[in-house]
């Protein structure tokens, strides 16, 4: 072979956000003839010679960075592309509102606003039906969205998470679906808002050509920033919204 | 984790220039960026910020209007686009990854706006 | 605009004694029991360094003679034993309210 070997791609199946107890399958693909491939979980000692890992119910501590290579005689591949697998379902689910409301004039402006009870201080908004909507929601530190000269092109269904910058591989629920509709345009979406796939089924048919397993692989949690509150669904009390707005 | 700024340089007032920010070790795409600027009395402000799919901007009264933070996740690339500028711009600009805290800066580049 | 006010501009403390730099903030910066206040080391000709999130979580890599504490307006950043090597200027920074705003930082030296 000639010239420096091309780096592997790493995917997660069907999404890498997971919901605590669903499946994930994370896959590792370089070039045909592959010897031997290495998929490894940073900051941890634990790694696999194996292309696949299935993991069968999602848990908090498999959630983190990933990446992988391949060898082929002597030669190693540079490192994929780190993966960043999250857990989601971990804490309860943020409330997701529109300002001043879900239907909005084609060509005015609306803030999407996602709120929570717990001291969070990350926020991930993503529109259904979106290429890739469920793999890569918006982020940032704001938990307002700001859509700024709306268009057809905006309505649709959008749902946010929250997460703390602590940990920031273990998030929120889903909020609830919003509806954002665009009035004063007869121009059809682009795109008609899906489901995110979740179900055990939907997964399975999308993988139906991995069938090994290694669940016998067993995982460490990375060592992340601390987190500074706990919450719990049952025991926090409601609160206002956490705003980030100019005083 | 690696940022590397690029494009400073020394403008007129009025001028326009262009900074990028090259991102390394880490994936970009997951995270919201943004832009920190120290003027040469020592002073850190911070100058904008753009979600981690660049669909969302914020910026502070005192640029709003002039520059227009990008980002092009295919590249792992972080821009500032600056224009209208006036001496008070004259300063370090930093591209950090953004956590509402900033938590890598770059090494910097240098914008000198003087006639 | 929340303004962080730092003091003191400077301060010189011997090797191996205690450094106290403080910060008020003109309003709380905290919210849900978490203080939205941060903090950064930074050396000549080099950029800041994040020092502390959240008024008192140690960033990975810094050792543990840094402490940070403080909620709502009041905030302090302390160094013992303080080393040679943490000649440089502190800066605080909060988050709870955009604009994002720094403190003017305070500059430490060796005695």
């Known amino acids: 072979q000639r010239g420096p070997l091309p780096k592997p791609s790493l995917q997660a199946l069907p999404s890498s956000l997971v919901p605590l107890e669903k499946p994930v399958t994370l896959r590792c693909q370089g070039p045909p003839g592959v010897d031997l491939y290495r998929l490894e979980k940073l900051s941890s000692s634990r790694y696999q010679d194996q292309a696949v890992l299935f993991i069968p119910a999602m848990k908090r501590h498999l959630a983190g960075r990933y990446r992988c290579s391949y060898q082929n005689g002597s030669l190693w591949s540079p490192p994929s592309d780190q993966l960043e697998l999250v857990a989601t379902g971990v804490f309860a689910k943020p409330s997701l509102s529109a300002q001043p409301g879900p239907a909005v004039s084609s060509g005015g402006d609306v803030t999407l606003q996602c709120q929570t009870r717990y001291g969070f201080d990350q926020f991930a908004l993503y529109k259904e039906g979106d290429p890739a909507p469920y793999k890569n929601p918006e982020r940032w530190y704001r938990a307002s969205f700001p859509i700024i000269t709306v268009t057809a092109a905006h309505s649709g269904t959008y749902r946010c998470y929250s997460f703390s910058s602590g940990d920031p591989y273990l998030w929120s629920a889903p909020s609830d679906p919003l509806e954002l509709m665009v009035t004063g345009t007869s121009v059809t979406p682009s795109r008609l808002p899906t489901e995110p796939p979740s179900s055990v089924a939907e997964f399975s048919e999308a993988t139906a050509e991995l069938t090994v397993s290694f669940t016998n692989k067993v995982f460490t949690t990375e060592t992340s920033r601390s987190i500074t509150t706990s919450p719990k669904e049952s025991d926090s009390p409601a609160g206002p919204a956490r705003q980030y707005y100019t005083k | 984790v690696m940022l590397v700024e690029s494009g400073g340089g020394l403008v007129k007032p009025g001028g326009s220039l262009k900074l990028s920010c090259a991102a390394s070790?880490?994936?970009?795409?997951?995270?919201?960026m943004s832009w920190v600027r120290q003027t040469p009395e020592k002073r850190l402000e911070w100058v904008a910020t753009?979600?981690?799919?660049?669909?969302?901007?914020y910026y502070p009264d005192s640029v709003k209007g002039r520059f227009t933070i990008s980002r092009d996740n295919a590249k792992n690339t972080l821009y500032l686009q600056m224009s209208s500028l006036r001496s008070a711009d004259t300063a370090m600009y930093y591209c950090a990854r953004d956590y509402g805290y900033f938590d890598y800066w770059g090494q910097g580049t240098t914008l000198t706006v003087s006639s | 605009d929340i303004v962080l006010t730092q003091s003191p501009a400077s301060l010189a403390v011997s090797l191996g004694q205690r450094a106290t730099i403080s910060c008020r903030a003109s309003e709380s910066v905290d919210n849900y029991g978490i203080s939205f206040m941060h903090w950064y080391q930074q050396k000549p000709g080099q950029p800041p360094k994040l020092l502390f999130y959240r008024a008192s979580n140690l960033e990975s890599g810094i050792p543990a003679r840094f402490s940070g504490s403080g909620s709502r307006t009041d905030f302090t950043l302390t160094i013992n034993p303080v080393e040679t090597d943490d000649v440089a200027t502190y800066y605080c920074q909060q988050s709870n309210t955009d604009p994002r705003t720094f403190g003017g930082g305070t500059k430490l030296e060796i005695k």
């Open positions: 070790g880490f994936t970009f795409s997951s995270y919201a």
């Open positions: 753009i979600s981690s799919g660049g669909s969302y901007t």
